[in-house]
Interface confidence: medium
C-alpha cells in the first residue's frame, strides 16, 4: 500500500514523518519552548537531526526572510556546554557555525548567515523567531 | 515627550504629486523603523509601506512601489512620503507611525496630514 | 491574505464584549496581532500589543488571545464604559505586508 502522508495543523508544513510550524514572533528561548508545547501533539522547539532535515527547513524559512536568525530546540541548561535537544531527540548531527560558544550563550539558533544551515549560540533571553515541530 | 508632527492638508489636482512630512521629537532618530499609513474616511488603516531611520532603507507595499517614495533626513529628524501621479482615489488621512524599537507595534502615531485630490 | 471583523457590535455599560479577528490564510498564531482603538478624528492608538500584551496605560479591561482552531484572535473588554465607544482594528503581517483588520465599530448602549 502506498504510505499517505499525515495531516498537520493548518500552516504547519509536513516532511518526514514532522510537522513544523515556523513561527515569526519574538519570544525568549523559554517562552519559545513554553509557546510550542501549548500546541500539544507532543510539540517542542523543533530538534533537527540531519542535514536532509536541515536543508528541508532551511529552503522552507528562506522563503519568508532570510536575515532573522530562530531559536531551535537545542540548548546547554547545565551551562557546561553539554548540549542537548529539549525534545529528547539524540545529540549526534551537529552543525555549528564555528564561531566562539563562549560567554552567557546558551540556547542554539539557526544563523542566517549561511542560510539557516548552521547554528549559532545566543543568548536565552534574546526575543527571536522560532520554530517547532511534533510528530503527527 | 514621544511625538510624531505631521504638515498640514493638502490640496492637489490629479496627476500632480505630494509630499508630507513627519517630524520626530523626544526620541533618537535613529535604528527605528517608521511607517506610512493612509485612511480612506469611513475605511480602516491601509499600510503602504516603511523606511529604517538608520540606514534609509525602505519597504514598500505592493500597491504602492514605483509611486511612492519614502525619504528621511537625519539632521532634521524628518521623514517624507512622496505620492506621484495622484487620483482621486488618493484622497485620504496619511499618518506616519513609529514602529517601537522594543515590540512589534507601532506605539507612537502623527495626527494625520488630509490630502484630497480633485479636479 | 485578509483579517475580517464583524462590521459592529453593541453592548451596555458594564457588560462583557468580544471583537473578533480571523484571517483568511496561514495560521493566525505564526505572526503577532495587535489591536487598535480610534476614536472620530483621532489617530489609531495601541490597545494590545503581541497578542496579548497591553501597553503602559491600558486599563486591564482590555484583553488580547487567539485561537488556531478557528483561526482568529479576539479582542475582550470587560466593565464596558461609555468612552470605550470607537472603531477597533486588528492588526497582522505576512513577513512583508502589515495588514488591517476591516474595522469593528462599537457602540455602548
Known amino acids: 500500500d502506498i504510505i499517505m502522508r499525515p495531516s498537520c495543523a493548518p500552516g504547519w508544513f509536513y516532511h518526514k514523518s514532522n510537522c513544523y510550524g515556523y513561527f515569526r514572533k519574538l519570544r525568549n528561548w523559554s517562552d519559545a519552548e513554553l509557546e510550542c508545547q501549548s500546541y500539544g501533539n507532543g510539540a517542542h522547539l523543533a530538534s533537527i537531526l540531519s542535514l536532509k532535515e536541515a536543508s528541508t527547513i532551511a529552503e522552507y524559512i528562506s522563503g519568508y526572510q532570510r536575515s532573522q536568525p530562530i531559536w531551535i530546540g537545542l540548548h546547554d541548561p547545565q551551562k557546561r556546554q553539554q548540549w542537548q535537544w529539549i525534545d529528547g531527540a539524540m545529540y549526534l548531527y551537529r552543525s555549528w557555525s564555528g564561531k566562539s560558544m563562549g560567554g552567557n550563550k546558551h540556547c542554539a539558533e539557526m544563523s542566517s548567515n549561511n542560510n539557516f544551515l548552521t547554528w549559532s549560540s545566543n543568548e536565552c533571553n534574546k526575543r527571536q523567531h522560532f520554530l517547532c515541530k511534533y510528530r503527527p | 515627550q514621544v511625538q510624531l508632527v505631521q504638515s498640514g492638508a493638502e490640496v492637489k489636482k490629479p496627476g500632480a504629486s505630494v509630499k508630507v512630512s513627519c517630524k520626530a521629537a523626544?526620541?533618537?532618530?535613529?535604528?527605528?523603523?517608521l511607517h506610512w499609513l493612509r485612511q480612506v474616511p469611513g475605511q480602516g488603516p491601509e499600510w503602504m509601506g516603511w523606511?529604517?531611520?538608520?540606514?534609509?532603507?525602505?519597504n514598500y507595499g505592493e500597491k504602492f512601489q514605483g509611486r511612492v517614495t519614502m525619504t528621511r533626513d537625519r539632521p532634521s529628524s524628518t521623514a517624507y512620503m512622496e505620492i506621484k501621479s495622484l487620483r482621486v482615489d488618493d484622497t485620504a488621512v496619511y499618518y506616519c507611525?513609529?514602529?517601537?524599537?522594543?515590540?512589534?507595534?507601532?506605539?507612537?502615531w502623527g495626527r494625520g496630514t488630509l490630502v484630497t485630490v480633485s479636479s | 491574505f485578509m483579517l475580517t471583523q464583524p462590521h459592529s457590535v453593541s453592548e451596555s455599560p458594564g457588560k462583557t464584549v468580544t471583537i473578533s479577528c480571523t484571517r483568511s490564510?496561514?495560521?493566525?498564531?505564526?505572526?503577532?496581532v495587535q489591536w487598535y482603538q480610534q476614536r472620530p478624528g483621532s489617530a489609531p492608538t495601541t490597545l494590545i500589543y503581541?497578542?496579548?500584551?497591553?501597553p503602559s496605560g491600558v486599563p486591564d479591561r482590555f484583553s488580547g488571545s487567539i485561537d488556531s482552531s478557528s483561526n482568529s484572535a479576539s479582542l475582550t473588554i470587560s466593565n464596558l464604559k461609555t468612552e470605550d465607544e470607537a472603531d477597533y482594528y486588528c492588526?497582522?503581517?505576512?513577513?512583508?505586508?502589515?495588514?488591517f483588520g476591516t474595522g469593528t465599530k462599537l457602540t455602548v448602549l
Open positions: 507611525a513609529r514602529e517601537s524599537p522594543v515590540v512589534e507595534a507601532m506605539d507612537v
Open positions: 503581541e497578542d496579548n500584551q497591553r
Open positions: 523626544g526620541f533618537r532618530f535613529s535604528g527605528d523603523y
Open positions: 492588526q497582522s503581517y505576512d513577513g512583508s505586508n502589515y495588514v
Open positions: 523606511i529604517n531611520l538608520s540606514s534609509g532603507g525602505t
Open positions: 490564510s496561514d495560521n493566525i498564531a505564526f505572526n503577532y
